[in-house]
């Protein structure tokens, strides 16, 4: 249930050179400092628990400052063998191959990881990011070009004495940053190996993991300002819920989407909100320190608990489902856009979600546990919350059974 | 500074096709949708469509289903707009506007001439 | 569709005068309505938006009012760069419909 078990080994209160070793926002992503190669190259990797490679812009793209250059380094071993990874909407591809690899600000250790070269792009880099790869954290099994290329965690974990867990802290600015902001703000924390008590108030409630390949986990239950959405639970989770930090949204399957838009909007209703608000196409915006939070609801998703017939709920707040956006041309104004948008492929627990935690991924337990974040944007009325035990009967029901094809689909 | 550049002007034959294309720099191209406006000469305007670069969702206007085709190209943070099967009725000036609150950014224009 | 409906076409005024531009929505679109201006061979330009707030860099001469249906657009102490066609928009529903305009003449 809470996590008042005994301290693990490797599990101390506090890892302060780990602590504000990301950086970035929600809109285009957290990364972290990492080097490959020898001598060491430095790259800022974008931090993805919704994919499985490791892979790095490694020839020159109009949107990288930088890119890995394999033959500057002595340590790098060619796979011979190509890598092609095709998402809704664009694809990368690259040529594998193996690299020393180290997080500065993470666990003292250097590890021999298969990296994905990056050599030809689309839709994939994104223009300012200040992002040079991806660090695919989720499991072997949607790795590409199949699950026999090792992911980067489990190649740490089985060369190390690191822990096999790691956990994150975004933390949403809830005002616009613009580019040398980001550079110099602190956007949350990475810890490998371990949770930092400090960077979480209350206790951590866990859910099962319920299949390794995606993080992918179970929600019994959705509530708008406490009013149940009502919906067979299947639908919650059709056709899967993974917790991604790779995505800036809080994703949900086309009829939940639209059952949670329709009872927003009918709290929210004091205010009458252009239809491109709903679909993420228009900003709303406020004078400046003026916005209205009370009047948008709250969003609770109860989560399968540890215990037979036991959930718990994690709620987000407005501060967390509008998203800041500076544009020059309302710059009086705070301006926000609608951080919820629909899915073809399940429910995606994206930043949104996780801006308002400590999400810790257990994956020595099989398990994710979630806390009020110490970090989290909220106002003086209402605050962040994981709450529990609450009673849910039938809970395995909720988990939707895909028919088994090959379907991987990263960082959307 | 937000800016959108616009193609030059296309002197086309009825039946035929054109592609317009719309650069924009000064912002994060995936992060806002495009649109594209009709102005005849002398009239008022009309909302064609409009295209998320980050993931290619479209919605048009259904009076230009069939006939405007938007793309995007976020190497070159692009869009592309293609007119097809062209009358005079599609002689016009079309403008690109980004997304905001209403359309705060437009393009310079485009003007197309239908002419045999 | 929404129909957006500027009466009248024309307005004549001398510099230093006050006018006001209206906009008649065939339904409902709340505060979701910008104006443009839009002067010979150039782009439109983005004056007011939420039927109210003035786009950065917009003079506060110009100023929008109205919820609903009935939108107005009023000019202070117009200029002689003021000659313009302004159009009406409402961004509350697709597809978006702007009116017909109202071209600003000086006396």
């Known amino acids: 249930e809470t996590d008042e078990e005994p301290e693990e080994p490797g599990r101390r209160g506090s890892f302060v050179e780990m602590v504000d070793n990301l950086r970035g926002k929600s809109g285009q992503g957290y990364y972290v400092e990492m080097t490959v190669g020898s001598p060491p190259q430095t790259l800022n990797i974008l931090v993805d628990t919704g994919s499985s490679n490791f892979a790095v812009g490694a020839a020159p793209h109009p949107f990288l400052h930088r890119y890995y250059q394999r033959q500057l380094s002595s340590t790098y071993r060619d796979l011979r063998k190509g890598v092609y990874v095709p998402y809704t909407q664009g694809k990368w591809e690259g040529e594998l191959g193996t690299d020393l690899v180290s997080i500065p600000h993470g666990p003292n250790v250097t590890v021999r990881a298969n990296i994905a070269a990056i050599t030809e792009s689309d839709k994939f880099f994104i223009n300012g990011s200040n992002w040079e790869g991806i660090l695919g954290l989720a499991y072997a099994e949607i790795a590409r070009p199949d699950d026999s290329l090792e992911p980067f965690f489990d190649s740490l974990v089985k060369q190390t004495h690191v822990p096999n867990l790691f956990s994150l802290q975004l933390c949403g600015a809830g005002f616009p940053l613009n580019q040398s902001e980001v550079l110099a703000s602190v956007g949350g924390s990475m810890i490998i190996g371990g949770i930092d008590h400090s960077l979480y108030t209350g206790s951590l409630w866990y859910t099962p993991i319920r299949r390794e390949w995606y993080y992918e986990v179970i929600i019994v239950r959705v509530e708008i300002n406490g009013q149940d959405l009502k919906m067979d639970c299947k639908e919650y989770n059709y056709d899967k819920s993974i917790v991604d930090s790779g995505t800036t949204n809080l994703r949900l399957p086309k009829k939940v989407f639209e059952a949670a838009v329709k009872s927003i909007k009918a709290a929210s209703s004091t205010e009458k909100f252009p239809d491109g608000f709903w679909l993420g196409e228009q900003l709303v915006c406020w004078q400046a320190g003026t916005t209205p939070w009370n009047i948008f609801p709250v969003i609770s998703l109860y989560l399968m608990g540890e215990v037979t017939n036991q959930s718990f709920r994690i709620t987000i707040l407005p501060q967390q489902y509008l998203r800041p956006v500076e544009d020059v041309a309302t710059s009086q104004d705070d301006c926000y856009k609608f951080a919820i948008s629909q899915s073809s492929t399940g429910t995606v627990m994206g930043a949104v979600i996780m801006e308002g935690f400590y999400v810790v991924f257990d994956r020595a337990r099989k398990r994710i546990g979630f806390a009020v974040s110490a970090c989290h944007v909220h106002d003086e009325f209402r605050t962040a919350a994981v709450e529990g035990p609450f009673v849910t009967l039938d809970m395995e029901d909720c988990g939707y059974n895909i028919p088994q094809t090959d379907e991987s689909t990263l960082m959307t | 500074e937000v800016q959108l550049q616009q193609s030059g002007a296309e002197l086309v034959r009825p039946g035929t096709s054109v592609k317009l294309s719309c650069k924009a720099s000064g912002y994060t191209f995936n992060n806002y949708w495009m649109h594209w406006v009709k102005q005849r000469p002398g009239q008022g305007l009309e909302w064609i469509g409009m295209i998320d670069p980050s993931d290619d969702d479209i919605k048009n206007n259904q009076k230009f289903k069939g006939k405007a085709t938007l793309t995007v190209d976020t190497s070159s943070s692009t869009a592309y707009m293609q007119l097809i099967s062209l009358t005079s009725e599609d002689s016009a000036v079309y403008y690109c506007?980004?997304?905001?609150?209403?359309?705060?950014?437009w393009g310079q224009g485009t003007l197309v001439t239908v002419s045999a | 569709d929404i129909v957006m409906t500027q009466s009248q076409k024309f307005m004549s005024k001398s510099v230093g005068d006050t006018v006001s531009v209206t906009c008649k929505a065939s339904q409902d679109v709340g505060r979701n309505v910008a104006w443009y201006q839009q002067k010979s061979g150039q782009s439109p330009k983005s004056l007011i938006y939420?039927?109210?707030h003035r786009y950065s860099g917009v003079p506060d001469r110009f100023t929008g009012s109205g919820s609903g249906t009935d939108f107005t657009l009023t000019i202070s102490n117009v200029q002689s760069e003021d000659l313009a066609d302004y159009f009406c928009q409402q961004y509350n529903s697709y597809p978006y419909t702007f009116g017909g305009g109202t071209r600003l003449e000086i006396k």
């Open positions: 939420s039927a109210s």
């Open positions: 506007a980004r997304s905001g609150v209403a359309l705060p950014y």
